[in-house]
């Protein structure tokens, strides 16, 4: 009898009430693998969720978040409110990044600006709430002791400073 059920393809279930005949999944349900004894209820994308892919007899519905929200968790199990770049979501809503931190996305937390000096670099462009610092050449490249009267050859390897 077990062999009869294993013959039931995806999109059907093995109906014990009908001598293990393969019956199609009822409306709003699906089975993604063969040999199933029941069909699973289709996920419904309601509220902050919107349908990305309709449910079929062989696959569950897939949800996205409505505008102003973004997905969290496996298979978009939750929707979280978007913030603007330069902000982070707190319990009290969207708050601007503190000085010295940035967030370049509509989600996630504010992160500290890169400390260029820790990486042996100088600052090329200052950071903002929306953008990290851009580091430039190392201070050693900029020091008088590193200078030379000879300008760099135009064909030198990139990544090297003019000294």
């Amino acid at each position: 009898l077990q062999d009869l059920c294993s013959n039931c393809p995806a999109g059907t279930f093995c109906d014990n009430n009908r001598s293990q005949i393969c019956s199609p999944c009822p409306p709003n349900s699906f089975s993604s693998a063969g040999g199933q004894r029941t069909c699973d209820i289709c996920r419904q994308c309601k509220g902050v969720f919107k349908t990305r892919k309709e449910c079929s007899s062989t696959s569950n519905a897939e949800c996205d978040c409505i505008s102003g929200y973004h997905c969290l968790g496996a298979e978009c199990s939750m929707c979280e409110q978007d913030c603007k770049q330069g902000q982070e979501l707190t319990k009290k809503g969207c708050k601007d990044c503190c000085f010295g931190t940035f967030n370049d996305q509509k989600r996630g937390i504010c992160r500290p600006w890169t400390n260029c000096s820790l990486d042996g670099k100088s600052v090329l462009v200052n950071g903002t709430k929306e953008r990290d610092v851009v580091c430039g050449p190392s201070p050693a490249d900029l020091s008088p002791g590193a200078s030379s009267a000879t300008p760099p050859a135009p064909a030198r390897e990139p990544g090297h400073s003019p000294q």
Partner: nanobody, 125 residues
Amino acid sequence: QVQLVESGGGVVQPGRSLRLSCAASGSTFSIVAMGWYRQAPGKGLELVASIITGDGDTNYADSVKGRFTISRDNSKNTMYLQMNSLRAEDTAVYYCYARTGYGSSWLMGHEYDYWGQGTQVTVSS
């Protein structure tokens, strides 16, 4: 790879103006910021001005604020430095610089900064 070529340098009298250009070629899509550095005789490199290629945000050295303006034309892959009210102390070799990444991050096997060959600016009466 990114190649940078400066132009526009020369000899000019104090109080006059010059405009430097820096034309970028190659993998210009990877450039996030560009800047102008200068090196006066016997001195180290000094950052004059810098610009974010995306939003055009700019930074200036105190010594040039109100006199110099950095700008870019992304459609031409070119950065400019408009230098007004030039002074003798602005005499230097001016170098174009490009950076391919925020913070100090860089990809293994990829250069993250590039320099032009330099253009001489001499302010003299």
